[in-house]
């Protein structure tokens, strides 16, 4: 805590500028008006203040806004954001996506901090749901964000937001998460035509049930082996040889290379040898 001392003559700050870097902590406390600081927050980041000086500036803002900073100040916090505690951030009401982006930018290239996690939580709760634009922003900064959400949290994601999901955003999801995301994707993309639909739904198919795989087999989708290998084993097992052949199209030959791996291995064991022989791949049940 900085002692309350009178500002030396001629040192009263008229604006936030470079001259302040030469002020001692007590001089900043005494000579910088908190209201001036709040209106010129955007200048703070252009000035190479020390961590100790930033502590003083934060203290001044805390005194001015004991109930939490207004968004006009939050949006221009810049590196001062790194000085905030989760408790500080819980007092904020952040509604603008631009504010969120500005603060995420400060932490860019680093793993998630408690401050950023609290900020995201406050923002999403304030919006009421994880909408498309928010998800788009969060996955741009944190590609693993979607797969860090629990199945319970994912269940509250509206299907319309699924349009923001890129295939790589699902790379780290587990089967339980895909079980929740797949029906949402199916709903989101339902009005697309066959080939376009398959391109969009492909990344989510690890959560697809048997009946949907059967339906896809009727649409000449030519699923690649990499996608097939990510399907739920319990969803693949009931498929007939003819259905798998239609599902994979020209990629069916790839089954031979994967015959010892799930779900192919388990599926082969469920088929009649006569049916497997029709593929001409030498698969042994």
């Amino acid at each position: 805590e900085v002692e309350k001392t009178a500002c030396p003559s001629g040192k009263k700050a008229r604006e936030i500028d470079e001259s302040l870097i030469f002020y001692k902590k007590w001089e900043l406390e005494a000579c910088v008006d908190a209201a001036l600081l709040a209106t010129q927050m955007d200048r703070v980041n252009a000035i190479p203040f020390t961590y100790e000086q930033l502590d003083v500036l934060k203290h001044k803002l805390d005194e001015l806004y004991p109930q939490g900073y207004p968004e006009s100040v939050i949006q221009h916090l810049g590196y001062l954001f790194l000085k905030m505690s989760p408790e500080d951030i819980r007092k904020w009401n952040v509604t603008s996506l631009e504010t969120l982006k500005a603060l995420l930018e400060v932490n860019k290239g680093h793993e998630m901090s408690p401050q950023v996690a609290t900020l995201i939580d406050r923002f999403v709760k304030g919006r009421g749901q994880l909408d498309k634009d928010t998800l788009d922003t969060l996955t741009a900064f944190y590609p693993g964000y979607l797969c860090s959400l629990s199945p319970e949290e994912l269940s509250s994601v509206p299907p319309s937001s699924i349009w923001a999901v890129r295939p790589q955003d699902l790379d780290t999801c587990d089967p339980r998460q895909l079980d929740v995301l797949y029906p949402k994707a199916r709903l989101a993309f339902q009005n697309m035509n066959g080939s376009e639909y398959f391109v969009k739904i492909q990344s989510f198919l690890g959560g697809a049930p048997t009946e949907d795989l059967k339906a896809l087999s009727q649409q000449n989708v030519s699923m690649d082996l990499a996608t097939f290998m990510k399907l739920r084993t319990d969803a693949v097992l009931p498929l007939t040889v003819a259905e798998v052949q239609k599902l994979l199209g020209p990629h069916v030959e790839g089954l031979k290379a994967e015959e010892r791996h799930r779900p192919v291995r388990d599926w082969i064991l469920r088929q009649r040898q006569d049916d497997l022989d029709t593929l001409g791949l030498g698969l042994q049940g």
Partner: nanobody, 116 residues
Framework: QVHLMESGGGSVQAGGSLRLSCVAS????????MRWYRQAPGKEREFVSA???????SYADSVKGRFTISQDNARKTVYLQMASLKPEDTAMYYC??????????WGQGTQVTVSS
């Protein structure tokens, strides 16, 4: 860089219990997602359980009701309490950590053998 170290594996009779631990070191970021996978001889690695950033959990159907995942954030440790073990639970058990930036890290694994 993140390093994961599993421990707690061993041999046990069917019906017995074991508690696996996985300790993370390095910059894991805040509230990473922790998962357990297992790989039986000659089979693929399969999902067992997860604990997500909001501390809720999920399980593969084959272990639901028998296994419990938990976490000690202060110690950067995730646990897998395994009860009512069956011979088909025999496998190498691996811990996996995923950060919110999408970086994935695997441990070296710990062997669990259940005999009938």
């Amino acid at each position: 860089q993140v390093h994961l170290m599993e421990s707690g594996g061993g041999s046990v009779q069917a019906g017995g219990s074991l508690r696996l631990s996985c300790v993370a070191s390095g910059d894991t970021g805040y509230q990473p997602t922790m998962r357990w996978y297992r790989q039986a001889p000659g089979k693929e690695r399969e999902f067992v359980s997860a604990i997500y950033s909001d501390q809720t959990t999920s399980y593969a159907d084959s272990v639901k009701g028998r296994f419990t995942i938990s976490q000690d954030n202060a110690r950067k440790t995730v646990y897998l309490q395994m009860a009512s073990l069956k011979p088909e639970d025999t496998a190498m058990y691996y811990c996996k950590l995923t950060t919110r930036r999408g970086s994935e890290y695997w441990g070296q694994g710990t062997q669990v053998t259940v005999s009938s």
